[in-house]
């Protein structure tokens, strides 16, 4: 299991530090959830061959996963601290229908599913304390949710393997974008 | 075993130019993110620069934008910090370090970094 954000890695010649700014926390948050992630891959790889399904292939889904686009502001041309940190805690809250789904998909990496679930809830109020403009966030709707993972569940082993490991790659994608982001805040 | 070793530190006037070196050995460049950091006399340890191998994604601290370019050869694992216009405030002891992270996202932070060199030498002064 990757380190829990705030123990320290094998450093060489590292540096002692100060205790982390806000801005550091929530980098390291996300890094924690992508190391969980990237455990999670490896099983997800292991059991089936959706790693090795091509992109085009992987795209005719209906999922509404969040992904980043230029009007969200997050990338290096047009970036707007204000209206990506909007973008990012909206997806961020988009994605926990789709990490509650991946609950129950996991045999040997179960604990990390968990672990990947609850630290997105941490990293979101973390980056709601740093957002000014609140109002400007739409949570999803809980009925809505519900329904979805209702039909997400209800579908074969084959298109549910293919929904995980969606959710992952997507997942995945998101956090990488947020953290190049975040660096320019 | 992981060795980051840097090189191509020195005495330069102000406005000059210097190339730093960092030679990985113990693994392979291919899938992380390489930073270079600075650390003054008294100060905390800054990131510079950034480069990952993934998607080339690169990273510049404000104060060097314009001046410094990174860059990465896989083929002989090496890493170099060209650092041109430099200022007395660029002195620093500069370090690289490694995050071997699979997902290779720059960081200005020193807390993902699993591995540093020892440092080498900048001093800008006339």
């Known amino acids: 299991a990757p380190v829990p954000p705030g123990e320290d890695s094998k450093d060489v010649a590292a540096p002692h530090r100060q205790p982390l700014t806000s801005s550091e926390r929530i980098d390291k948050q996300i890094r924690y959830i992508l190391d969980g992630i990237s455990a999670l891959r490896k099983e997800t790889c292991n059991k089936s061959n959706m790693c090795e399904s091509s992109k085009e292939a992987l795209a005719e889904n209906n999922l509404n996963l969040p992904k980043m686009a230029e009007k969200d502001g997050c990338f290096q041309s047009g970036f707007n601290e204000e209206t990506c940190l909007v973008k990012i805690i909206t997806g961020l809250l988009e994605f926990e229908v789709y990490l509650e789904y991946l609950q129950n998909r996991f045999e040997s990496s179960e604990e990390q599913a968990r672990a990947v679930q609850m630290s997105t809830k941490v990293l979101i109020q973390f980056l709601q304390k740093k957002a000014k403009n609140l109002d400007a966030i739409t949570t999803p709707d809980p009925t809505t949710n519900a329904s979805l993972l209702t039909k997400l569940q209800a579908q074969n082993q084959w298109l549910q393997d293919m929904t995980t490991h969606l959710i992952l790659r997507s997942f995945k994608e998101f956090l990488q974008s947020s953290l190049r982001a975040l660096r320019q805040m | 075993q992981v060795q980051l070793v840097e090189s191509g530190g020195g005495l330069v006037q102000p406005g000059g130019s210097l190339r730093l070196s960092c030679a990985a050995s113990g693994f392979t460049l291919d899938d992380s993110a390489i930073g270079w950091f600075r650390q003054a006399p008294g100060k905390e340890r800054e990131g510079v620069s950034c480069?990952?191998?993934?998607?080339?994604?690169?990273y510049y601290d404000d104060s060097v934008k314009g001046r410094f370019t990174i860059s990465r050869d896989n083929v002989k694992n090496m890493v170099y910090l060209q650092m041109n216009s430099l200022k007395p405030e660029d002195t620093a002891v500069y370090f690289c370090a490694i995050d071997l992270s699979d997902y290779g996202v720059c960081s200005k932070w020193p807390s993902p970094y699993d591995y540093w060199g020892q440092g080498t030498q900048v001093t800008v002064s006339s």
């Open positions: 480069i990952s191998s993934s998607d080339g994604d690169t």
